[in-house]
């Protein structure tokens, strides 16, 4: 049977009708509407936008649209006591101060409530001391400094360039190195593309532009004061000293004009190699401290931001399923922005809005999806994925029993070169099949499929003729659904041709210059890339909610499990002597993967052959598919990261944005040669192999014939 017959609707109401209803002009109009004023989490402006979206989703035809509010810890600069950094002379006089705000873009000079650049959740403090330049402040950068160069960061203020890894990991690394303050800056090498002008004349970062952002290390906890539970009216809140993930040292971001002033005076050690040099006309000396003439000068930070429990609002819309109303397909993206949110998040929110409108149009014509679709406009994503996490904590029992899939919808674009998809392997075939049916928006690919342009521009490193699909990491609202609850998840957006800068974001990311005009003038004047992303996200939701058999292929999980097992075994084999000494074997893991592969293959055969007109058998097979992702969840979580519970994937311990496979084994092996107790360290490796092997075997058994 077709999905149309399954829900008793006319053939007109199929995927094509849904996709044809999506219009680029509407996305453009919605983006404009959402970006005229700032919508910072916890502000009145963002509450008003929540109510507007609630009202419009109701008009579009959803069955119900509710606000879900929580009282969570947020962070704001002190309006009367601004944050800044100084160079001070030996008498303590401030001889240079960093700027207090970004020069506003043309047309926005009179907009109020533009939050100045700050690092959210920085503690207050006025540390002063010598500067040490730590490159990107990655784990390997601190290894280079401490182990190879013998430079001690203890009691120093470190300056790190943005890019490569999540800023919270940079701060954590600096804290562990003993730093007493962190200055983050955007280097033109990472945020200024050659041959492109600065905003407002192009999409590059001007010298006065600064990237805002939170510096938490939440590891999936949500609200720092209520980990594991919703921040509702009767919540018990931890004291600030027990809060999860807060930094312990002051942190502040600056632009490259101000960074130039700090870095040009640096003395001490020369950079270890060219990878430590950016594009400023400075020596990129590591320090510590300033060079000869300036050696008596110090750097002083002045940070006065405050942490405040503040109300936030999610908008939750429901389109009830006709056949399986107790099965939920979720499309969610955030609404809060640092300033105008021209790309992040409103290019995503505008797409969600248009998807809701299209679904609503079909519903008004008598159609319903087979399964329930939930639409979410999350709040406080920028402050640590708080809105999505609190809602999932509140609804975890429903979600773990009924959640089919979660599709994320933050920024629709980070470039205009090709598609970028990160998802569970269960969705690979869905994404492939869908993109084969969509038209490519790319120049030179007229009349060709999206699959074709995507595969040509971003080929899979393993499989010829297929596009690259990446692992899910974190840093966005899918985190709680995938990493904590084990709900199959995916995300899609248009990206740049800039593989080397994968985790640095686009130049104007989280700056005041992320405006509607940035998108309309430079990224997507015709909104054709936005439309394509709407088709991909919306098409995935449509198929997940409407296909009779869930569009998940468990055989693709088998393929990646073998790849990940090979990879982690090869990492371990870098220590052959220790493996032999401590009798380390991956046999159990390879055996479990082999079993998974065989059982998945047999399940797929049964999936082709079973009687789809038998609703009990259909539901049984679909439940096995739905619960497969759930089967990779370990209720005990990963070591020291209880809210990262997926055994196959977790955010990298060194970069929240990146996904790591078999993270428990990976972390146990990481830097194992430096562990003081090798016997204990290799014992933990063996334990993690055991956990992984057991989990893969247990997941395989969920696909076996039930009796």
């Amino acid at each position: 049977k077709s999905s149309n017959e399954a829900t008793n609707i006319t053939p007109k109401h199929n995927m094509k009708a849904f996709l044809d209803e999506l219009k680029a002009e509407n996305i453009k109009k919605f983006l404009y509407n959402f970006t005229q004023i700032p919508h910072l989490a916890g502000t009145e402006q963002n509450f008003q936008l929540a109510k507007q979206i609630q009202s419009q989703w109701k008009e579009f035809g959803l069955d119900s649209v509710e606000l879900a509010h929580y009282d969570v810890l947020l962070s704001y600069p002190n309006k009367t006591h601004p944050n800044y950094i100084s160079i001070i002379n030996e008498d303590g006089n401030e001889i240079f101060n960093t700027s207090l705000f970004e020069p506003p873009p043309p047309g926005y000079e009179n907009v109020s409530d533009i939050v100045p650049p700050f690092s959210a959740f920085s503690p207050q403090g006025m540390p002063e001391g010598d500067l040490v330049y730590v490159n990107y402040a990655r784990t390997e950068d601190f290894f280079k400094l401490e182990r190879d160069m013998k430079i001690n960061c203890s009691g120093k203020i470190v300056i790190a360039r943005y890019g490569k890894v999540f800023r919270g990991n940079k701060v954590k690394n600096a804290q562990l190195a003993g730093a007493k303050g962190v200055i983050l800056y955007s280097d033109p090498a990472d945020y200024f593309a050659p041959g492109v002008k600065s905003y407002p004349d192009g999409w590059n970062l001007p010298g006065g532009g600064v990237q805002r952002g939170n510096i938490l290390n939440l590891n999936g906890a949500g609200d720092p004061l209520t980990p594991g539970y919703p921040a509702n009216e009767y919540a018990y809140r931890r004291g600030i000293a027990e809060a999860v993930g807060l930094p312990s040292i002051p942190v502040h971001p600056i632009g490259y004009y101000d960074a130039q002033k700090l870095l040009e005076k640096m003395g001490g050690s020369a950079p270890p190699d060219s990878s430590w040099r950016g594009s400023l006309k400075v020596p990129y000396n590591v320090g510590p401290g300033f060079t000869g003439n300036f050696s008596t000068q110090k750097v002083k930070m002045h940070i006065h931001s405050t942490n405040e429990v503040t109300r936030i609002y999610n908008v939750i819309g429901t389109l009830r399923g006709a056949v399986e109303p107790d099965r939920y397909v979720i499309l969610g993206g955030h609404r809060d922005s640092w300033v105008f949110g021209g790309i992040d998040p409103q290019s995503g929110a505008a797409v969600v809005h248009e998807i809701v409108r299209s679904f609503g149009t079909l519903k008004k014509e008598g159609w319903r999806p087979r399964r329930t679709i939930l639409f979410a406009s999350w709040d406080a994503e920028e402050f640590g994925l708080l809105g999505s996490t609190e809602w999932a904590e509140e609804n975890s029992r429903l979600l773990q029993e009924r959640g089919v899939a979660y599709i994320n919808a933050d920024s629709s674009i980070e470039g205009n070169y090709t598609l970028r998809v990160d998802c569970t392997p269960l969705m690979y075939s869905l994404v492939h099949n869908l993109t084969k049916e969509l038209k490519s928006p790319d120049e030179g690919f007229e009349g060709k499929s999206l699959y074709e342009s995507w595969t040509k521009k971003s080929p899979s490193p393993e499989f010829s003729g297929m596009p690259r699909i990446s692992k899910l990491g974190s840093g966005n609202d899918f985190e709680v659904f995938f990493q904590r609850l084990g709900i199959a998840s995916g995300r899609a957006r248009y990206t740049k041709n800039w593989e080397t800068n994968k985790f640095s974001g686009y130049p104007l990311y989280h700056s005041v210059y992320e405006t509607y005009e940035l998108v309309e003038k430079f990224y997507d004047p015709m909104f054709k890339y936005h439309l394509t992303v709407a088709q991909v996200r919306g098409g995935m939701v449509f198929e997940l909610a409407n296909s009779i058999v869930l569009p998940f292929d468990c055989r693709d999980y088998a393929v990646v499990l073998r790849k990940y097992a090979d990879k982690i075994y090869s990492i371990s084999m870098k220590h052959p002597q220790e493996m032999k000494t401590y009798s380390v074997s991956f046999d159990s893991l390879f055996s479990a993967v082999k079993n998974f592969t065989e059982i998945a293959s047999k399940f797929s055969e049964r999936l082709q052959d079973f009687d789809k007109s038998n609703p009990i058998v259909l539901r049984m097979m679909n439940d096995q598919l739905m619960f497969l992702e759930r089967a990779f969840i370990d209720p005990l979580g990963l070591p020291d990261r209880p809210f990262y519970r997926h055994v196959i994937y977790a955010p990298s311990s060194h970069n929240k944005y990146a996904g790591e496979s078999f993270p428990g084994i990976y972390d146990a092996l990481f830097d194992i040669e430096s562990k003081v107790d090798p016997s204990k360290a290799w014992g933990e490796v063996k334990r993690q192999i055991y956990v992984a092997a057991f989990t893969v075997q247990a997941a395989a058994e969920t696909l076996s014939e039930v009796a």
Partner: nanobody
């Protein structure tokens, strides 16, 4: 009694490709219980695993070398071989072929080793 014997040039020029072959005698290479690997020991340094292959040709490589390494197996000749491209002086080492139990680092048989020097 299983025996492994490495063969190949003892001197390789920088930027060229190092090629070694290991011939296995006294037993079959076609066993699913074992992998066939290459290890090396640079002068004054510890043992380094390069990579391994099983009888079907499935390979495992040291992540820090994998962009330069190719290991292949020829079951008809009971041989497996190593190619290491773009060599530098840091690749100078005694190279051993060895058998190890699948999914472990339990090397139970190895060749006597061959010194390969990278020099112009």
């Amino acid at each position: 009694q299983l025996q492994l014997q490495e063969s190949g040039p003892g001197l390789v020029k920088p930027s060229e490709t190092l090629s070694l072959t290991c011939t296995v005698s006294g037993g079959s290479i076609s066993s699913s219980s074992y992998y066939w690997g290459w290890i090396r020991q640079p002068p004054g340094k510890g043992l380094e695993w390069i990579g391994s292959v099983d009888y079907s040709g499935y390979t495992y490589y040291n992540p820090s070398l994998q962009s330069r390494v190719t290991i292949s197996v020829d079951t008809s000749k009971n041989q497996f071989s190593l190619k290491l491209s773009s060599v530098t002086a840091a690749d100078t080492a005694v190279y051993n072929c060895a058998r190890h139990k699948a999914a472990t680092a339990d090397f139970d048989y190895r060749g006597q080793g061959t010194l390969v020097t990278v020099s112009s």
